[in-house]
Interface confidence: low
Amino acid sequence: ELCDDDPPEIPHATFKAMAYKEGTMLNCECKRGFRRIKSGSLYMLCTGNSSHSSWDNQCQCTSSATRNTTKQVTPQPEEQKERKTTEMQSPMQPVDQASLPGHCREPPPWENEATERIYHFVVGQMVYYQCVQGYRALHRGPAESVCKMTHGKTRWTQPQLICTGEMETSQFPGEEKPQASPEGRPESETSCLVTTTDFQIQTEMAATMETSIFTTEYQ
């Protein structure tokens, strides 16, 4: 079951999967000036059997200027175009991907691939967040999000991560600095959003893991 939407956006943070659950699709995207070969796959698919998992299909790019190939490029479905992208980067946490049954490792790069990879995650996928350079994490702890299925709907749990600039104070977004009483919570805490305002968006956040917010990671 593919996840309906993308992992939560955390300001000043990026996410990365350490391993990919079977069923995950990776778009075969090529960098500017290149395109998929005429009979090339639209995506790679993580598949597996009882012993191991691997990526089916291979992405292949060719120069758009090549004359002996068709110029028509199969357009990507709109939904796929809108999926979240993850920058290619080294894993944020040391995880032995091979030790996770039912998961594929990060696919090796292919020639002339795009700078960003577009994944289509499945239920049960976990991604890890980290603050981008120049920002630091408040509330250290599990900064992960899991795609969960509830009542026929999929949703991502909210990672326990707030990234703030070095010069900012350690406060929640939208929270004002306490004026008088250092022990009291600013009054705006309960009123500044008027009619709005985790359960781990944990809302929690992994079912049996004590990781993060109310909606599914209450632990």
């Epitope: 305002t197 359960f199 944990q202 809302t203 929690e204 917010i213």
Partner: antibody
Framework: PGASVKVSCKAS????????MHWVRQAPGQGLEWMGI????????SYAQKFQGRVTMTRDTSTSTVYMELSSLRSEDTAVYYC?????????WGQGTLVTVSS | QPGLTQPPSASETPGQRVTISCSGS????????VYWYQQLPGTAPKLLIY???QRPSGVPGRFSGSKSGTSASLAISGLRSEDEADYYC???????????FGGGTKLTV
């Protein structure tokens, strides 16, 4: 009784699409009761079993507003309805909207 | 019927310490984080403790939370009159795929 009500909840001061929003209600003199959750980013929802089929949660990203519509109202639906943002627990709550169901 | 069980009331004198219990099951407290909320009369609930024992900024150190197995507790030391409020525990429930609250404990100081 039998009618529907749509409660709105406008967010400000943070990135609306980055955090889930929950709806919790509280009947007079009673405790808190979770109704459901909506992801403002994609619009996906998850409702408490008790309200399945009667509640619909939506959002309007252009106005950073989430909505909770409850149909087939009964007298026992009389309560204060809160929306609450989800980060490290329900850290920001709306002031609540009192919905009274009477004939 | 609340998903978590709390004593309906608790009473203690100023300056003393009080503990409020919250009992659940393996599908909620046993496998998920516990949260505590304080609701002063006529106001919206306020997050007091998150992830079992963490305090949001602005919450006094007099408030502490703990969890063991399928139970959790909130302790308030150096009680003050302004601590008079209703206290709720909450957790995600894997079986229900939703948040469950305790019935609430009315604290009288």
């Amino acid at each position: 009784p039998g009618a529907s009500v749509k409660v709105s909840c406008k967010a400000s001061g943070y990135t609306f699409t980055s955090y889930y929003m929950h709806w919790v209600r509280q009947a007079p003199g009673q405790g808190l009761e979770w109704m459901g959750i909506i992801n403002p980013s994609g619009g996906s929802t998850s409702y408490a079993q008790k309200f399945q089929g009667r509640v619909t949660m939506t959002r309007d990203t252009s106005t950073s507003t989430v909505y909770m519509e409850l149909s087939s109202l009964r007298s026992e639906d009389t309560a204060v309805y809160y929306c609450a943002r989800d980060i490290l627990g329900l850290d920001y709550w709306g002031q609540g909207t009192l919905v009274t169901v009477s004939s | 019927q609340p998903g978590l069980t709390q004593p309906p009331s608790a009473s203690e004198t100023p300056g003393q310490r009080v503990t409020i219990s919250c009992s659940g099951s393996s599908s909620n407290i046993g496998s998920n984080y516990v949260y505590w909320y304080q609701q002063l009369p006529g106001t919206a609930p306020k997050l007091l403790i998150y992830r079992n024992n963490q305090r949001p900024s602005g919450v006094p150190g007099r408030f502490s939370g703990s969890k063991s197995g399928t139970s959790a507790s909130l302790a308030i030391s150096g009680l003050r009159s302004e601590d008079e409020a209703d206290y709720y525990c909450a957790a995600w429930d894997d079986s229900l795929s939703g948040v469950v609250f305790g019935g609430g404990t009315k604290l009288t100081v």
